[in-house]
């Protein structure tokens, strides 16, 4: 009778095992082991027992002990079961961003591992088991479908293999795949709201605001604002599920014409875009031209107004005849025209909007000097010792210099409060002088003496 010990062994792949072959007779003619595995007999005394070290066991094997005794030949098999953990445990690649509400298929592939009867594949979200199945096929594949929820954001999905050899007196061997971190998102179907000027003048700045509600996670949203080829650099402020991106846009003469303003919101692997057209225009203020800005009284003056070729102008409220970009008026300069404003208003239609520009010029009329009764009375009668202020206003442009002298030396204190004395009485020659000439006027001061009772 041949026996073998152990009759059943589970060992790691590539491992070694000692197998004892025994026979019941004392002097066997033959005692050995038949195996394709590398073997080495241990040096042990005695004839009826032999021990072999079987090494580099790569797969399940059934070495057979045999003995030849006087009463016949017999054999006994031992069953070597090799265990090894899978060489590959992998989740099939998926885009890291997944929209909320989508069905996501997780696929785990497992290569290798034995014994397969003890190998289980587990799909997990964090530590929560989603599916558990025995490993079948090579490679073994286990799939499950997950409905993506908002609260899955940042969750780690993984695949774990469990080689459970506890029933064989060994341990539970676990292998885990690299985790797949799910990023969930909500990008509403509504495009972003874009608020911007429809028209924008060259060499000015405008403000563009792009906003969108109902985003998740809002902090991960990317906002791209552009005017034509010019990328704008917005300042983004975030709400709970909304953002507002504000940017300043500057335009130059090169941008003139119709430009596309775009606001694109990118979240996950989706995007929403809003397009708007902005008309960039150049509209300098109209030009008011006076023949001369400073003329003498009585001079003929031409006032011209010139604007953008497509503009329509009015000069001092009077539309150009015919209606167009030019208007003019003629006048003979009078003192009343001094400081008169000539206002030109130009209107240009840009993309259905009326743009107004004004330009004003002032005419200076040189006249005078003038001394008249109204502003410089020729006769004053004042009681002696009373407080009086002599008034005499000379007119003209430029404003004349005024002096009133009695006997060529004694001045009348114009505009000053004085106590009337006998000395003040007399006739004064008031002289108003400017670059335009001079005029004189006699002013008499009478002093009334008080009556003595």
């Amino acid at each position: 009778q041949t026996s073998v010990s152990p009759s059943k062994v589970i060992l790691p792949r590539g491992g070694s095992v000692l197998v004892t072959c025994s026979t019941s007779c004392d002097q066997p003619k033959l005692l050995g082991i038949e195996t394709p595995l590398p073997k080495k007999e241990l040096l042990l005394p005695g004839n009826n027992r032999k021990v072999y070290e079987l090494s580099n066991v790569q797969e399940d094997s059934q070495p057979m002990c045999y003995s030849n005794c006087p009463d016949g030949q017999s054999t006994a098999k031992t069953f070597l079961t090799v265990y090894w953990t899978p060489e590959r445990v992998e989740l099939a690649p998926l885009p890291s961003w997944q929209p909320v509400g989508k069905n996501l298929t997780l696929r785990c592939q497992v290569e290798g591992g034995a014994p397969r009867a003890n190998l289980t594949v587990v799909l997990l979200r964090g530590e929560k088991e989603l599916k558990r199945e025995p490993a079948v096929g090579e490679p073994a594949e286990v799939t499950t479908t997950v409905l993506v929820r908002r609260d899955h954001h940042g969750a780690n999905f993984s695949c774990r293999t469990e080689l459970d050899l506890r029933p064989q007196g060994l341990e539970l061997f676990e292998n885990t795949s690299a985790p797949y971190q799910l990023q969930t998102f909500v990008l509403p179907a509504t495009p972003p709201q874009l608020v911007s000027p429809r028209v924008l003048e060259v060499d000015t700045q405008g403000t563009v605001v792009c906003s969108l509600d109902g985003l998740f996670p809002v902090s991960e949203a990317q906002v791209h604002l552009a005017l034509g080829d010019q990328r704008l650099n917005p300042t983004v402020t975030y709400g709970n599920d909304s953002f507002s991106a504000k940017a300043s846009v500057s335009v130059t003469a090169e941008d003139e014409g119709t430009q596309r303003l775009t606001c694109a919101v990118i979240l996950g692997n989706q995007s929403q875009e809003t397009l708007q057209t902005v008309t960039i225009y150049s509209f300098p203020a109209p030009n008011v031209i006076l023949t001369k800005p400073e003329v003498s009284e009585g001079t003929e003056v031409t006032v011209k107004c010139e604007a953008h070729p497509r503009a329509k102008v009015t000069l001092n409220g009077v539309p150009a005849q015919p209606l167009g970009p030019r208007a003019q008026l003629l006048l003979k300069a009078t003192p009343e025209d001094n400081g008169r404003s000539f206002s030109c208003s130009a209107t240009l239609e840009v993309a259905g909007q009326l743009i107004h520009k004004n330009q004003t010029r002032e005419l200076r009329v040189l006249y005078g000097p003038r001394l008249d009764e109204r502003d410089c009375p020729g006769n004053w009668t004042w009681p002696e010792n009373s407080q009086q202020t002599p008034m005499c206003q000379a007119w003209g442009n430029p404003l004349p210099e005024l002096k009133c002298l009695k006997d060529g030396t004694f001045p009348l204190p114009i505009g000053e409060s004085v106590t009337v004395t006998r000395d003040l009485e007399g006739t004064y020659l008031c002289r108003a002088r400017s670059t335009q000439g001079e005029v004189t006027r006699k002013v008499t001061v009478n002093v009334l003496s008080p009556r003595y009772e």
């Epitope: 241990l42 040096l43 042990l44 005394p45 027992r49 021990v51």
Partner: antibody
Framework: EVQLLESGGGLVQPGGSLRLSCAAS????????MSWVRQAPGKGLEWVAF????????YYADSVKGRFTISRDNSKNTLYLQMNSLRAEDTAVYYC??????????WGQGTLVTVSS | QSVLTQPPSASGTPGQRVTISCTGS?????????VHWYQQLPGTAPKLLIY???NRPSGVPDRFSGSKSGTSASLAISGLRSEDEADYYC???????????FGGGTKLTV
């Protein structure tokens, strides 16, 4: 760390008996073949006795056959050598050693047995 | 009288190389059984030095090497050091005796 610790040595008269013990630790004793090897003062090493891991087979050197008995208690991780009818030529340091299957890979520190009247 | 024969002594100076021989017969070394070597430092238990003719257990310096040819084997120690001063024993198995054999030992003096 494999450790083998012998005890039980001492002075005994010729014809007397002594029981040596070897406490094993740091390995699975119940899977190990064990042996006793001795060394007479100033002499070389001599194999004495051998026992299978399960105690089922025992072998002895001709010089001690019939007088010495090797045994083991796997529950206590202990190897024994019962020495009867001791002679002066049995005086030696007795080592317990673990047998790998081809060589003695670990040895105890030894215990001295002196047989003298 | 040991069945495996070793020279009783050997000596060398530090840095030298020494060789210790072990001669057996056709029932042990000559029968293909492996030779193993043990080092016994003064006052201590033997320690496995070389196994299966020429393999070193971990922790044994590569200054120690073994070889086997026919019915004999040898242990070589190169770059001799003072701490190598010890007794060295060869060991094999004898099929006719069904017993483990040790050589008589060689005392190495450095």
């Amino acid at each position: 760390e494999v450790q083998l610790l012998e005890s039980g040595g001492g002075l005994v008269q010729p014809g007397g008996s002594l029981r040596l013990s070897c406490a094993a630790s740091g390995f699975t004793f119940s899977n190990a073949w064990m042996s006793w090897v001795r060394q007479a003062p100033g002499k070389g090493l001599e194999w004495v006795a051998f026992i299978w891991y399960d105690g089922s087979n025992k072998y002895y050197a001709d010089s001690v056959k019939g007088r010495f008995t090797i045994s083991r208690d796997n529950s206590k991780n202990t190897l024994y050598l019962q020495m009867n009818s001791l002679r002066a030529e049995d005086t030696a340091v007795y080592y317990c050693a673990r047998y790998s299957g081809w060589y003695f890979d670990y040895w105890g520190q030894g215990t001295l047995v002196t047989v003298s009247s | 009288q040991s069945v495996l024969t070793q020279p009783p002594s050997a000596s060398g100076t530090p840095g030298q190389r020494v060789t210790i021989s072990c001669t057996g017969s056709s029932s042990n070394i000559g029968a293909g059984y492996d030779v193993h070597w043990y080092q016994q430092l003064p006052g201590t238990a033997p320690k496995l030095l070389i196994y299966d003719n020429n393999n070193r257990p971990s922790g044994v310096p590569d200054r120690f090497s073994g070889s086997k040819s026919g019915t004999s084997a040898s242990l070589a120690i190169s770059g001799l050091r003072s701490e190598d001063e010890a007794d060295y024993y060869c060991q094999s198995y004898d099929s006719s005796l069904s017993a483990w054999l040790f050589g008589g030992g060689t005392k190495l003096t450095v």
